[in-house]
């Protein structure tokens, strides 16, 4: 058993049918010695008396808010949560496996640049009685500071018969140098509590590996005289690290017909313009990627050919 | 992804082309190592990230873009002293800091070159003959060093009398390649920045 926060405790259970569970001793936070009784949640049934209460915690019915009283007055509370260990592996019931970029990916994180700011998000099908708390650091043995905000519900989607909820959090490394070569990864830890179930999820990454630039901005077409060709031009996104000559991007320009089946013409360039043939009803899209470190491509910025 | 090959203009900063080749070569070598050594811990998540140049050179600090010198988090110690002549500076008015930067890059390359050559000698003794260093990568390191053209003492190749532990050597190769790829990215950024200056 360990303390998650004041008066909230996590009991770790080896979770299998007929498991013996864990013996837990609760102590009433009071100078009083006599006349103390214990109850669980809203029930008025007295579970025991005395300054301490010993319970065998086996399943969720044994978890909850234990309260000690004296003469009708509440003295203190202890909330017990359960953390299930199933065959040596901590349970992951609360969050959905996003399966990207690989199986067992519960937290996904992205950064728009090298400033040390990043966003993480996760998915769940649970809509109520759910709380999250996020901590982060650079490295784990001698951790350096990363400050995270509160996790907020950022999107709701309908997936088949189920509703899916997306939560996200923004974090900022306290003293980040955009040009630094990372040798210690960022660690992100999310505590999730659903009703009386506790779970924790972690992710470890280098900022350089989660970079995903914003799409190029100001995408424009300039027709070339007496030709089906057009000059496409764009600019670096505002959110990208500066100077651009140091943090350079490379671009992919795509000409896509109306039908998804039509052949796509693609050109790669380090410049912020390209000459392409504009077909009728086609659209031109441009996306960006770090020129020197192949992390994710940005989403496409698009304009119609007409 | 293959990086687009930039053909250098005659007047272009001479080292840019070499640094792009270097990054391409080390990335290819790392990819090859990860595929060949699939049963070894060779991914970014599994290895310890060590920097053999730590406390010996300070390339990131010495080569910091001017725009980032206002960022206090970027300003670590700049105490290492370097040699300050080199042909990449040809026909350019260059500051002392730029010479320091290029000299630091040269020292990095020299250190990695020695490590890779020593390691290759060990890998050639492996009866499994599983993996060797790409000669192209070693050649590209050499080319960039020549382009930088700094006069510096030659570091003797480390020779080891004891029987090599091939498992450890292959893991060290992965560690070195990951670190060298990160340094090659920095070098490429620096060359791109200097070319635009």
């Amino acid at each position: 058993i360990w303390e998650l926060k004041k008066d909230v405790y996590v009991v770790e259970l080896d979770w299998y049918p007929d498991a013996p569970g864990e013996m837990v001793v609760l102590t009433c936070d009071t100078p009083e010695e006599d006349g103390i009784t214990w109850t669980l949640d809203q029930s008025s049934e007295v579970l025991g008396s005395g300054k301490t209460l010993t319970i065998q915690v086996k399943e969720f019915g044994d978890a909850g808010q234990y309260t000690c009283h004296k003469g009708g007055e509440v003295l203190s509370h202890s909330l017990l949560l359960l953390h299930k260990k199933e065959d040596g592996i901590w349970s992951t019931d609360i969050l959905k496996d996003q399966k990207e970029p690989k199986n067992k990916t519960f937290l996904r994180c992205e950064a728009k640049n090298y400033s040390g700011r990043f966003t993480c998000w996760w998915l769940t099908t649970i809509s109520t009685d759910l709380t999250f708390s996020v901590k982060s650091s650079r490295g784990s043995s001698d951790p350096q500071g990363v400050t995270c905000g509160a996790a907020t519900l950022s999107a709701e989607r309908v997936r088949g018969d189920n509703k899916e909820y997306e939560y996200s959090v923004e974090c900022q490394e306290d003293s980040a140098c955009p040009a630094a070569e990372e040798s210690l990864p960022i660690e992100v830890m999310v505590d999730a509590v659903h009703k009386l179930k506790y779970e924790n999820y972690t992710s470890s990454f280098f900022i350089r590996d989660i970079i995903k630039p914003d799409p190029p901005k100001n995408l424009q077409l300039k027709p070339l005289k007496n030709s089906r060709q057009v000059e496409v031009s764009w600019e670096y996104p505002d959110t990208w690290s500066t100077p651009h000559s140091y943090f350079s991007l490379t671009f992919c320009v795509q000409v896509q017909g109306k039908s998804k089946r039509e052949k796509k013409d693609r050109v790669f360039t380090d410049k912020t313009s390209a000459t392409v043939i504009c077909r009728k009803n086609a659209s031109i899209s441009v996306r960006a990627q770090d020129r020197y470190y192949s992390s994710s491509w940005s989403e496409w910025a698009s304009v119609p050919c007409s | 992804r293959n990086l687009p090959v930039a053909t250098p203009d005659p007047g272009m900063f001479p080292c840019l082309h070499h640094s792009q080749n270097l990054l391409r070569a080390v990335s290819n070598m790392l990819q090859k190592a990860r595929q060949t050594l699939e049963f070894y811990p060779c991914t970014s998540e599994e290895i310890d990230h060590e920097d053999i140049t730590k406390d010996k050179t300070s390339t990131v600090e010495a080569c910091l873009p001017l725009e980032l010198t206002k960022n206090e988090s970027c300003l670590n110690s700049r105490e290492t002293s370097f040699i300050t002549n080199g042909s990449c500076l040809a026909s350019r008015k260059t500051s002392f800091m730029m010479a320091l930067c290029l000299s630091s890059i040269y020292e990095d390359l020299k250190m990695y070159q020695v490590e890779f050559k020593t390691m290759n000698a060990k890998l050639l003794m492996d009866p499994k003959r599983q993996i060797f260093l790409d000669q192209n990568m070693l050649a590209v390191i050499d080319e960039l060093m020549q382009a930088l053209n700094f006069n510096s003492e030659t570091v003797p190749q480390k020779s080891s009398l004891e029987e090599p532990d091939f498992y450890k050597t292959k893991i060290k190769l992965c560690i070195l390649l990951h670190a060298f790829r990160i340094r090659a990215v920095t070098i490429d950024r620096v060359m791109s920045y200097l070319n635009a200056s």
Partner: antibody, heavy 115, light 112 residues
């Protein structure tokens, strides 16, 4: 004590269907994940499928994906394995099993796929 | 499709020490715990070892398990005639959990 009693096995022709059941008693069935494991005659153990305690997630071996469906009825304390498009290579003893560090197995039920 | 490799058979005379190896990889045994089962002919597997080296109550102490890196092993010290059976190791793979990963199985023969 924990008990898992299996039923539903038998002889079936290739291409046909069969449903296996596993009735649980002696524990809170709705709190635990469950597996199906099979063993072809003279061969080793092969995992078939898993279902979460609440039925929210199901996982299958590639060899049965799209043909077999694992399900559970927590009100009846019963686990099921619906097998469709059966093949000769599905011939095996099928076991249900609880998920956890200490596990309990059903007695096994024989499924023979033969024309 | 078996990722955990066991020797097909091992044998010993009563009282001898018999060991069975189970070889896996970094993503399975390297990251997760190992179980060992004993299966007597015509019966369901019986749990002998969980959590690499833990014995459930009722399992004789002549059975012991260990794990090192990407391999595990089961030792029977002072093998007895009733130990003649098939033995399977089991673990999980990081990418496919909760799919059970079984070893290829080892037939233990008690000679004499």
């Amino acid at each position: 004590q924990v008990q898992l009693v299996q039923s539903g096995g038998g002889v079936v022709q290739p291409g046909r269907s069969l449903r296996l059941s596993c009735a649980a008693s002696g524990f809170t069935f709705s709190s635990y994940g469950m597996h199906w494991v099979r063993q072809a005659p003279g061969k080793g153990l092969e995992w078939v499928a898993f279902i979460r305690y609440d039925g929210s997630n199901k996982y299958y071996a590639d060899s049965v994906k799209g043909r077999f469906t694992i399900s559970r009825d927590n009100s009846k304390n019963t686990l099921y394995l619906q097998m469709k498009s059966l093949r000769a290579e599905d011939t095996a003893v099928y076991y249900c099993k609880t998920h956890g560090s200490h596990d309990n197995w059903g007695q096994g039920t024989m499924v023979t796929v033969s024309s | 499709s078996y990722v955990l490799t066991q020797p097909p058979s091992v044998s010993g005379t009563p009282g001898q020490r018999v060991t069975i190896s189970c070889s896996g990889g970094r993503s399975n045994i390297g990251r997760n715990t190992v179980k060992w089962y004993q299966q007597l002919p015509g019966t369901a597997p019986k749990l002998l070892i969980y959590g690499n080296d833990q014995r459930p109550s009722g399992v004789p102490d002549r059975f012991s398990g260990s794990k090192s890196g990407t391999s595990a092993s089961l030792a029977i010290t002072g093998v007895q005639a009733e130990d003649e059976a098939d033995y399977y190791c089991q673990s999980y793979d990081r990418g496919t959990h909760p799919a059970l990963l079984f070893g290829t199985g080892t037939k233990v023969t008690v000679l004499g």
